[in-house]
Interface confidence: medium
């Protein structure tokens, strides 16, 4: 004979566990119904009745399979720095990351907490370390017979055109000048310039409206300009 | 239905203090959302005052930090505005209103409580 | 502090489509700004339209819908209707407050 389907709440065989999407209670000392993601517990489980799910309210959400009695508090609401890049709804938490051109000075377990922007090199340095989503730009001095004139977060140094006859020689954050006779060897004219870092940015649809209610908890650091290294701009 | 209703003493002197109520009948200020003040001055103008979460803590508009608080009584379902030192430039028409989280809309408001601040 | 400009007013007829706009003074609206649309009937009563750049209220008609239009928010009235002469307010998120712009007065030419 095939073994009876057991249904929730149900007392489990001894050593044996209880089956998926179910829990054990202790207080009842049963085998009981979990809440799917977007749920909670809103009354626990008894000997002879199942665990009773509620729907999560406004700006709260449970991602997993659950017995909690409360939904988790979503992330506060990104800071004009950043871009929403997961929208709070009831099975999933915010999530923010920096706009181009920042990086995350302080990073969360999803997304970034605190973004600043990107350090730009000011003339006579260019870039050694690009930025990434979570480093800032690391500025070097131009090497002799390299500049850079441009105040930068992507701009490198570049090597200074070669003349026939000097006009006015290159320094760090000057390009040789050269006679009217044109160089002999010349840099591309534009500056080079190192790929910005790109984040990947699903477009996230919020579903519709439905009854619903809770905020946001966590808290926003205050944003300062992040100081300026030798040879940077906190522009 | 979910209802907001201010009250509020309407005529204040001038350095005194601004208290004023918003009783929210058909949900828990527990529950959820954002629990807001905002004013209309005279000539339509709104500005957003702060709020209160649905576990007690606060957002206020930088421009009124220093003069400004919301709490709230979680028993009576109700929240206050407490907006320290004022001026004739806080005449308005003060409003409660309720925003979440997942939608960012502002869907209920309360009518309105006119606050006259003269000596 | 920012600033948050709308057309101060706007002129349609009924049936006509007609976008207000929302215009940021630190630049480009963006999502993370959560743009926020309330209407304002007479008697001070104010009904909140959209959230969060596109989300419609519970109740609003459909009619109603937000967007980002170039650097703007945006909100369309897709066939005009008498009752929709009101003043609409746009209200922008700025990573922890928020502001509302000065307001646009449509009439709707009946």
């Known amino acids: 004979l095939p073994a009876q389907v057991a249904f929730t709440p149900y007392a489990p065989e001894p050593g044996s566990t209880c089956r998926l999407r179910e829990y054990y209670d202790q207080t009842a000392q049963m085998c009981c119904s979990k809440c799917s993601p977007g749920q909670h517990a809103k009354v626990f489980c008894t000997k002879t009745s199942d665990t009773v799910c509620d729907s999560c309210e406004d700006s709260t959400y449970t991602q997993l399979w659950n017995w909690v009695p409360e939904c988790l508090s979503c992330g506060s609401r990104c800071s004009s720095d950043q871009v929403e890049t997961q929208a709070c709804t009831r099975e999933q938490n915010r999530i923010c990351t920096c706009r181009p051109g920042w990086y995350c000075a302080l990073s969360k377990q999803e997304g970034c907490r605190l973004c600043a922007p990107l350090r730009k090199c000011r003339p006579g340095f260019g870039v050694a370390r690009p930025g990434t989503e979570t480093s800032d730009v690391v500025c070097k001095p131009c090497a002799p017979g390299t500049f850079s004139n441009t105040t930068s977060s992507t701009d490198i140094c570049r090597p200074h055109q070669i003349c026939n006859v000097v006009a006015i020689p290159g320094n760090a954050s000057m390009d040789a000048v050269c006679t009217s006779t044109s160089p002999t060897r010349s840099m591309a004219p534009g500056a080079v310039h190192l790929p910005q870092p790109v984040s990947t940015r699903s477009q996230h649809t919020q579903p519709t409206p439905e009854p619903s209610t809770a905020p946001s908890t966590s808290f926003l650091l205050p944003m300062g300009p992040s100081p300026p290294a030798e040879g940077s701009t906190g522009d | 239905d979910v209802q907001l209703q201010e009250s509020g003493p309407g005529l204040v002197k001038p350095s005194q203090s601004l208290s004023l109520t918003c009783s929210v009948t058909g949900s828990s200020i527990t529950s959820g959302y954002y629990w807001n003040w905002i004013r209309q001055f005279p000539g339509n103008k709104l500005e957003w005052m702060g709020y209160i979460t649905n576990d007690g803590s606060n957002n206020y508009n930088p421009s009124l930090k220093n003069r400004i608080s919301i709490t709230r009584d979680t028993s009576e379902n109700q929240f206050f505005l407490k907006l320290n030192s004022v001026t004739t430039e806080d005449t308005a028409t003060y409003y409660c209103?309720?925003?979440?989280?997942?939608?960012?809309?502002?869907?209920?408001w309360g009518q309105g409580t006119t606050l006259t601040v003269s000596s | 502090q920012a600033v948050v400009t709308q057309e101060s007013a706007l002129t349609t007829s009924p049936g006509e489509t007609v976008t207000l706009t929302c215009r940021s003074s630190t630049g480009a609206v963006t999502t993370s700004n959560y743009a926020n649309w309330v209407q304002e009937k007479p008697d001070h009563l104010f009904t909140g339209l959209i959230g969060g750049t596109n989300n419609r209220a519970p109740g609003v008609p459909a009619r109603f819908s937000g967007s980002v239009i170039g650097d703007k928010a945006a909100l369309t009235i897709t066939g005009a209707q008498t009752e929709d002469e009101a003043i609409y307010f746009c209200?922008?998120?700025?990573?922890?407050?928020?502001?509302f712009g000065g307001g646009t007065k449509l009439t709707v030419l009946g």
């Open positions: 209200a922008l998120w700025y990573s922890n407050h928020w502001v």
């Open positions: 209103a309720r925003d979440g989280g997942w939608f960012h809309y502002f869907d209920y």
